[in-house]
């Protein structure tokens, strides 16, 4: 019969508010008190197996003892009532678990969405963590009809999907009740027509059609979601070129009501565009649909919009009365070619004489010309037509170029090599910029680009390397031929030299030494050599550093000690740092030349 508990604790299953006070009472049964010869004075209270100090106990009567907790901070307390029996042995009487937590807060930010074709889903902010099982119930009603409660699932406690069909044009009232063992609260009620909460399905079957008449347009067609019969739709249409990562958007005011097609204008010819579209209720109440699947189309070709860059080079070794001229041009970028380039047409007209025609597939043409003045034209052709002509005057052999650009400068900025100049007073048709890498090992292979006559600042559009010295030449081109070229050297990005200078002695005296060195080869300079530093020391002395201008190739060390071994090395510096050359040693003589002779004579 003693398997029966010796007593009980009241309350049996308490749930209390965190940081509140709580009192439990342990009541002993008479038969237990008799059996163990105890009363309430013998009760020992424990939480999680730790004895509670007696000061927290209250003896109510011979059978009952209470314990009071203030400011409960634990979520779960195992409370046991025990009695001290013979020989101070503890006997468990009863145990309970005190669960603590917080009452629910009033749910906030209740909002609902009707995904087209699905039932209405509402979500809310449930408030702080209660540490207790808290049930959320979504309530909804019409003025004349209560709908079944929607009980939020344990794993998604702050949203619920109703189980009735959505009816548009009828106002519905919705609210949330939150309830746990410590209380029940209700959110504010919201009242709305579900038509204002619609998230439409995205438009589908998006397709793109091009126009043979206009190379700057593409027509989009799509199928609207079924909800179009209930709401007027507005759209976002976005597009980008195939390789771009950012989207452009059609002005929303152009697509502000239900439609199933749209013509996108001001596009580039012969360009692949990707489109996507989404929709929502036209007054902006509700939600945007997801984006449609993307669809792409290519605008129709147009004739090339620009003449190619056009230049020439004359072979310096020419036979009597003739010269070899290489005409060169650049392929147009796709946005100017406007289609697949078929060929180039070159015409050459000897001054006031007959015309020669050439059709070329490459981007150069080598011709033998007399020493006369020639007019060359170049057009590029695609399926639709020809570009405007680029015109070039190849002056006669005795032509004297004049009027160069002035104040030519070149400098790196934003990982590009910029060139700027002051324009000559004369009317310039265009500028030709040529550049090549200066190297001791290889010839200067020229790349070039053309700029409009109004330009006086540009960057080199080649594939430039860092730490290479570029020789940049700017030639203004006039109606009657090229002007005088101007050149400048520049680096895209400097680095310290790869090697330092090798210093040697030219002449060594008792108290001075003339050092000499070679200019660093351009391939190892990696930048403009701004200055040199000569470091010299004796075996036991401190090192001395001397700065030397970069234009020098020799330097005299003075005030040296005679009959002394010197170690000397030299560093060359660019704007990005320096590099030491190898160390060289020399010894100063004991006597100056005259002194040695004088000693011999004396003896």
């Amino acid at each position: 019969e003693l398997l029966d508990p010796c007593g009980y604790i009241s309350p049996e299953s308490p749930v209390v508010q965190l940081h509140s006070n709580f009192t439990a009472v342990c009541v002993l049964k008479e038969k237990c008190m008799d059996y163990f010869h105890v009363n309430a004075n013998y009760i020992v209270w424990k939480t999680n197996h730790f004895t509670i100090p007696k000061e927290q106990y209250t003896i109510i009567n011979r059978t009952a003892s209470s314990v009071t907790f203030t400011d409960i901070a634990s979520l779960n307390i195992q409370l046991t009532c025990n009695i001290l029996t013979f020989g101070q042995l503890e006997q468990n009487v009863y145990g309970i678990t005190i669960i603590s937590g917080l009452p629910p807060e009033k749910p906030k930010n209740l909002s609902c969405i009707v995904n087209e074709g699905k039932k209405m889903r509402c979500e809310w902010d449930g408030g702080r963590e209660t540490h207790l099982e808290t049930n959320f119930t979504l309530k909804s009603e019409w003025a004349t009809h209560k709908f079944a409660d929607c009980k939020a699932k344990r794993d998604t406690p702050t949203s619920c999907t109703v189980d009735y069909s959505t009816v548009y044009f009828v106002n519905i009232e919705v609210w949330v009740e939150a309830e746990n063992a410590l209380g029940k609260v209700t959110s504010d009620h919201i009242n709305f027509d579900p038509v204002y909460k619609v998230k439409p399905n995205p438009p589908h079957n998006l397709s793109v059609i091009n126009s043979e008449e206009l190379s700057s347009i593409l027509k989009l067609t799509w199928t609207n979601p079924s909800i179009k019969s209930v709401i007027i739709l507005k759209y976002n249409i976005q597009y980008r070129t195939k390789d771009a990562s950012t989207w452009s958007q059609i002005p929303p005011e152009d697509t502000a009501s239900t439609r199933s097609s749209f013509t996108v204008q001001d596009l580039k010819p012969f360009t692949e565009y990707v489109f996507r579209i989404r929709c929502m209720k036209e007054d902006g109440k509700g939600y945007w649909s997801d984006w449609s699947e993307e669809a792409s189309g290519i605008t129709y070709e147009d004739r090339p919009s620009k003449a190619p860059s056009f230049w020439y080079k004359i072979d310096p070794s020419h036979t009597q009365g003739y010269r070899t001229v290489q005409l060169v041009w650049k392929t147009l970028p796709p946005f100017e070619a406007n289609g697949k380039i078929l060929d180039y047409e070159v015409t050459l007209t000897r001054w006031k004489s007959h015309l020669q025609n050439y059709t070329v597939n490459a981007t150069k043409l080598t011709v033998n010309l007399t020493n006369d003045r020639y007019l060359a034209t170049l057009t590029v052709r695609n399926l639709v037509g020809k570009s405007d002509a680029a015109v070039l005057t190849i002056p006669a052999c005795d032509f004297q170029a004049t009027h160069p650009v002035m104040d030519l400068k070149a400098f790196p900025k934003d990982n590009m090599l910029w060139v700027e100049w002051t324009t000559p007073r004369e009317s310039v048709k265009k500028y030709i910029l040529e550049w090549c890498v200066l190297s001791d090992k290889a010839p200067c292979i020229t790349d070039w680009q053309q700029e409009d006559g109004t330009v006086h600042r540009t960057y080199l559009r080649g594939n430039l390397a860092e730490s290479k010295c570029y020789l940049i030449t700017v030639t203004p081109v006039y109606a009657d031929g090229p002007g005088s070229p101007e050149s400048i050297k520049a680096y895209l990005k400097q680095a310290p030299p790869s090697k330092g200078p090798t210093v040697r002695t030219k002449k060594v005296g008792k108290n001075e030494a003339v050092l000499e060195w070679d200019q660093l080869p351009v391939d190892v300079q990696n930048g403009f050599i701004r200055n040199y530093t000569i470091f010299y020391r004796t075996i036991i002395g401190n090192e001395t550093a001397v700065n030397v201008d970069s234009s020098h190739t020799e330097y005299t060390l003075s005030s040296l000690t005679s009959d002394t071994l010197y170690m000397v090395r030299m560093a060359a510096y660019t704007d990005e740092g320096g590099k030491d050359g190898p160390e060289f040693t020399f010894t100063t003589p004991k006597f100056a030349q005259g002194e040695i002779e004088h000693h011999h004579h004396h003896h």
Partner: antibody, heavy 116, light 107 residues
Framework: EVQVVESGGDLLLPGGSLKLSCAVS????????MSWVRQTPDKRLELVAT????????YYPDSVKGRFTISRDNAKHTLYLQMSSLKSEDTAMYYC?????????WGQGTLVTVSA | VIVLTQSHKFMSTSVGDRVSITCKAS??????VAWYQQKVGHSPKLLIY???TRHTGVPDRFTGSGSGTDFTLTISNVQSEDLADYFC?????????FGGGTKLEIK
């Protein structure tokens, strides 16, 4: 007591236009969506237009879209149906009803006959 | 478009009997169904909505049941004033549509 009274029905030629009215009393007009439902001579019922309580959303089936326009004046407790480009198949008794999923309150109807 | 089929155009019953009028939807309409009674020369009158909920003032001998595609209006203890046409209607998706009607005749 709820009262719904339609008016404006007439006999007219195909291609003609007509405006029906519906006066409502006995319930809070501006709290309800309203509809026009027609019943053809063979007793078939068809919803022809619905408008929400504040008048900014409407619905029309394909059979009347672009030809019929539903509107309401909440101050006057009145519902309207403007019909144009009428066809012989539009011949029917036109009822005005408040909309609550079902249609709780209907008027007595107004007859529209389209015939050459 | 959801089509509602009331397979019996006419049904005959006696006063005091129980009669069931059926309505079948061409696709799932959940419980978004209403039933109407129309007596000769009168406008339709709402009896049931949400498939099972009686409209205000409708006698409890009218009972609605069903969900999905199959719905029934049951009149128990038929009275002579129940002589009328009965229509079902769905409001699950636009266009909201009506059945063709069932005429209840009293023997």
């Amino acid at each position: 007591e709820v009262q719904v009274v339609e008016s404006g029905g007439d006999l007219l030629l195909p291609g003609g236009s007509l405006k029906l009215s519906c006066a409502v009393s006995g319930f809070t007009f501006n709290a309800y969506g309203m509809s026009w439902v027609r019943q053809t001579p063979d007793k078939r019922l068809e919803l022809v237009a619905t408008i929400n309580s504040n008048g900014d959303s409407t619905y029309y089936p394909d059979s009347v879209k672009g030809r019929f326009t539903i509107s309401r004046d909440n101050a006057k407790h009145t519902l309207y149906l403007q019909m144009s480009s009428l066809k012989s198949e539009d011949t029917a008794m036109y009822y005005c009803a408040n909309f609550y999923g079902g249609f709780p309150y209907w008027g007595q109807g107004t007859l529209v006959t389209v015939s050459a | 478009v959801i089509v509602l089929t009331q397979s019996h155009k006419f049904m005959s019953t006696s006063v005091g009997d129980r009669v069931s009028i059926t309505c079948k939807a061409s696709q799932d309409v959940d419980t978004a169904v209403a039933w109407y009674q129309q007596k000769v020369g009168h406008s339709p009158k709402l009896l049931i909505y949400w498939a099972v909920t009686r409209h205000t003032g409708v006698p409890d001998r009218f009972t609605g049941s069903g969900s999905g595609t199959d719905f029934t209006l049951t009149i128990s203890n038929v009275q002579s004033e129940d002589l009328a046409d009965y229509f079902c209607q769905q409001y699950s998706s636009y266009p909201y549509t009506f059945g063709g009607g069932t005429k209840l005749e009293i023997k």
